[in-house]
């Protein structure tokens, strides 16, 4: 390794939190400007996958159906191969990620649309633990603009647990996006598609290196948090958009000061939504343990114009819309640590459905 | 046990070429094709310097120092990351590193370039 220098896997080093959240309660969901995917066939399995070739999804009116959009005019087509083998891979090539890595074909993808009435009270998901995710400024941390997000390489000793014996350490966080037209999130809520979303990538201490873990049953774990527009900016994001324009080039990648990555999250991190799925980028490997926060994070029409923007991606393309189409729940139940469900009653319902990482 | 290896490195006159290689083995085969792979340098008594990136995509980034004189590639179905060195300077004397970003970091030991007459 470098002389002098540490870090995770031998890495050598390169010489007021909340901005105020809403709950994702039905009331504030748009009943007319994002109509769900499909309405569900009687049985309660799900319909057959929409992908984002054929249309724009749930983020357009329904009046836009009849014109569809596809949301890939960012990001060229799959073939454009600039080296040996089959592993390029876009956001506008969805339906060729099965060709890249077949697990992209599975039956346990992410991201899946959160319908608030089909989920499962669970009481014995507790509030998740964080611990050493305030950093300070030194030492930096490496963002990265690698085509496809940006990405914050977090350094080692960020732990989160889901529960007990159940701990994780936080690898890196990306975003995904849409435009100043069309939101991008990658997961929905009753079809809604937010702005965008955040990802906290965590790998499981039962393993020491990630490929170890890739497509193992709670393996990796990862907390999303849906970015929504209000009036005031977001300082804790502020330290990561005011830095984009030093990586709008695709591949570039700068050092930035430590921050309080808990501050990216919601404060509420008691109310959530579970499930397992996969990595929403090829390989796409299953069995990851998703946890999708009920309160969003709020940021300024300025801050979300400019993660939109800013970047750009292969095949000189701004980099947008970079969000995976929702995929089909295949019998699995979203579980949440709260009555989510409109006609919830007041005692748990499928307590047993619960599951355990790993299980 | 993830190991990306360095070789190609060597002593050269100003003005000559090298070329290094980067071959992945082990657990590092299985997430090549999706790392941003890069090349680091770091010269003696110096921090460490990003040379070159080349993304998943096939996206290309150079220092300013290097640019028009080095290129990156790679090729997927070897598991193989490649930095071409030409017109090399004294100033380019340094251990070279090969570095894969895939959700973390994984580090090769590294070859010596030395640039001298």
């Known amino acids: 390794q470098p002389q002098g220098l540490s870090g995770m896997q031998g890495e050598p080093s390169l010489g007021d939190s909340s901005s105020g959240e809403d709950e994702l309660g039905v009331d504030v969901l748009p009943s007319e400007e994002d109509a769900p995917e499909e309405a569900d066939p009687p049985d309660g399995e799900d319909p057959p996958e929409v992908n984002s070739e054929d249309r724009m999804e749930e983020s357009l009116g329904l009046e836009d159906l009849s014109t569809p959009e596809a949301p890939e005019h960012s990001q060229g087509s799959h073939g454009d191969e600039k080296g040996g083998g089959h592993s390029h891979w876009s956001y506008g090539g969805t339906l060729l990620w099965p060709q890249v890595s077949p697990a992209c074909a599975g039956r346990f993808q992410s991201p899946v649309d959160i319908r608030l009435e089909r989920t499962a009270f669970c009481r014995t998901l507790q509030p998740l633990e964080l611990l050493g995710y305030e950093l300070q400024p030194l030492p930096e941390l490496s963002l990265s603009n690698n085509g496809h997000t940006v990405q914050l390489t977090l350094p080692p000793g960020l732990k989160m647990a889901l529960g007990p014996g159940q701990e994780y350490r936080a690898l890196q966080l990306h975003l995904h996006w849409g435009t100043s037209d069309h939101p991008g999130s990658e997961h929905t809520v009753n079809g809604h598609r937010f702005p965008a979303e955040i990802h906290v990538v965590h790998l499981s201490t039962a393993f020491s290196e990630l490929h170890e873990a890739l497509g193992r049953p709670g393996g990796l774990a990862v907390l999303a948090a849906f970015l929504q527009e209000s009036p005031e900016e977001n300082s804790a994001y502020e330290q990561l958009l005011s830095h984009l324009e030093e990586i709008s080039e695709e591949g570039s990648k700068i050092e930035i000061p430590g921050l309080d990555v808990s501050a990216l999250l919601p404060s509420d991190l008691s109310r959530y939504y579970r499930y397992e799925g996969s990595l929403t980028t090829p390989p796409c490997s299953q069995g990851v343990i998703w946890t999708v926060f009920n309160e969003t994070v709020k940021l300024s029409a300025k801050q979300l114009h400019t993660l939109s923007v800013s970047l750009w991606g292969p095949r000189d393309s701004r980099l947008q819309l970079n969000f995976r189409a929702t995929q089909p729940l295949n019998g699995r139940t979203i579980e949440a640590s709260f009555p989510a469900a409109e006609d919830s009653s007041p005692e748990p319902v499928h307590v047993n459905s619960c599951f355990t990482a790993g299980d | 046990q993830v190991q990306l290896v360095e070789s190609g490195g060597g002593l050269v006159q100003p003005g000559g070429s090298l070329r290094l290689s980067c071959s992945a083995s082990?657990?590092?085969?299985?997430?090549?094709?999706?790392?941003?792979m890069h090349w680091y340098r770091q010269a003696p008594g110096k921090g460490l310097e990003l040379v070159a990136v080349?993304?998943?995509?096939?996206?290309?980034y150079y220092a300013d120092s290097v640019k028009g004189r080095f290129t990156i590639s790679r090729d997927n179905s070897k598991k193989t990351l490649y930095l071409q060195m030409n017109s090399l300077r004294a100033e380019d004397t340094a251990v070279y590193y090969c570095?894969?970003?895939?959700?973390?970091?994984?580090w090769g030991q590294g070859t010596q370039v030395t640039v001298s007459s």
């Open positions: 080349i993304t998943s995509a096939g996206g290309t």
């Open positions: 570095n894969a970003d895939y959700y973390q970091d994984y």
């Open positions: 082990g657990g590092a085969r299985n997430i090549f094709s999706f790392a941003a």
